[in-house]
Amino acid sequence: KFSKQSWGLENEALIVRCPRQGKPSYTVDWYYSQTNKSIPTQERNRVFASGQLLKFLPAAVADSGIYTCIVRSPTFNRTGYANVTIYKKQSDCNVPDYLMYSTVSGSEKNSKIYCPTIDLYNWTAPLEWFKNCQALQGSRYRAHKSFLVIDNVMTEDAGDYTCKFIHNENGANYSVTATRSFTVKDEQGFSLFPVIGAPAQNEIKEVEIGKNANLTCSACFGKGTQFLAAVLWQLNGTKITDFGEPRIQQEEGQNQSFSNGLACLDMVLRIADVKEEDLLLQYDCLALNLHGLRRHTVRLSRKNPIDHHS
């Protein structure tokens, strides 16, 4: 139960944590299990113990084996085992399965790929990221803290992602790489910041004085059933019900529609017998959910009657 698999590449740094943990004040002794030989704590050694951590700086294939750690407290001892395998560097691009960390999944929303084991190392930003051995370039990829963010994830983003960073130990630098698979799932549902499909921002709608006019506010909120999502109209920043103009009414209830699999809502604003003063008002289509509020503004302009005289 208290055994942990760890792996690394020759000539890279590898740091392994004891699978048994205790207070920072407890002493931890490390041994090479095959020979029962104690691992030194002096940092001048290539392989040395530092409390709960066993450091290979850098690692060599011959370091492979089982290491025993014993956490010692005044009242008890706890024993753990670290099964360490150091592999030769591959000449080709393929990362074999035995070097892969756990697979992570992403979706249509922003996805994060965390660099495995990085919290064990003394590293400084930025991380370098590679996909199938190619350095990642383009605005969709952002190296942030200990993870990679991919914007607008697509199925083509699936693949093996490698993070590369430098571990610093007493002024000496050691390279570390770690690889994990990333899969893209077709999600059952999600919510997103509202996207207004209509009207366009700052749209001018032509209307005829004395006639009726309809304005439709339409927005999408994600995939699947949406909770606390709404579209509505405001006049000069005021709710329709509070504005007090009976000629201008919102349709009762919101119509739900689906566009490209997205859940959308629309609300119609009906203006009866359009008057000159209606052209002076600001009409705001608001779409909101728990992610926030988006607003598109519409103004009305008089439609010029067709001139029949030439």
Epitope: K112, Q188, L290
Partner: antibody, heavy 125, light 107 residues
């Protein structure tokens, strides 16, 4: 500082209704959504519904649809949760909480950042 | 709705221990995950949002990590005031759902 203060404990008979209030202070009430969560004795957290006060938009999770009504009074910066047709399994602590998204600068993250102290509702014959 | 599953449901630990709680989502939720702490008779308190960001005023011994479906809350050195129940919550799809909780007790 931001505070949500809820009304006191209630003892109710099965079949009756209860109305719990949640008074907000220390921030602009209309800029944030308020949600209601309940916790039965020794159980986890269950989301009931919520309201976006400035627009009066309320919504309820499927479990509570038809039995719960959430309202907000902008003038007193108070949100209300009314639960009807009470049964013994509705005995729980009811919490109001603020959603961290500010509607007027769309800033922040998505979480319940401030909570009321809770209101114990006991349903017993 | 998205199901959130926490493990373990309870654990016993000593002051100074490093404690790890995991949370798994029934579908990928990117990094839209929060962690809350609740003490008996009190309301929950937000600790971590967006999987790894520490809420203002929360001690740095609390940290969160993970993305996709698997997430972790770590308390690097358990303090007496940390004995409580911890809940994860997804904010990827409404309604935002909670895990069933993990109770951290004194050994």
């Amino acid at each position: 500082q931001v505070q949500l203060v809820q009304s006191g404990a209630e003892v109710k008979k099965p079949g009756s209704s209860v109305k719990v209030s949640c008074k907000a202070s220390g921030y602009t009430f209309t800029n944030y959504a308020i949600i209601w969560v309940r916790q039965a004795p020794g159980q986890g957290l269950e989301w009931m519904g919520g309201i976006i006060p400035v627009f009066g938009t309320a919504d309820y999770t499927q479990t509570f649809q038809g039995r719960v009504t959430i309202t907000a009074d902008e003038s007193t910066s108070t949100a209300y949760m009314e639960l009807s047709s009470l049964r013994s399994e509705d005995t729980a602590v009811y919490y109001c909480a603020r959603v961290s998204t500010n509607y007027y600068d769309s800033s922040g993250y998505y979480a319940f950042d401030y909570w009321g102290q809770g209101t114990l509702v006991t349903v017993s014959s | 709705d998205i199901q959130m599953t926490q493990s373990p449901s309870s654990l016993s630990a000593s002051v100074g221990d490093r404690v790890t709680i995991t949370c798994r989502a029934s579908q990928s939720i990117s990094s839209y995950l929060n962690w809350y702490q609740q003490k008996p008779g009190k309301a929950p308190k937000l600790l971590i949002y967006d999987a790894s960001s520490l809420q203002s005023g929360v001690p740095s011994r609390f940290s969160g990590s993970g993305s996709g479906t698997d997430f972790t809350l770590t308390i690097s050195s358990l303090q007496p005031e940390d004995f409580a129940t911890y809940y994860c919550q997804q904010t990827y799809h409404t309604p935002w759902t909670f895990g069933q909780g993990t109770k951290v007790e004194i050994k």
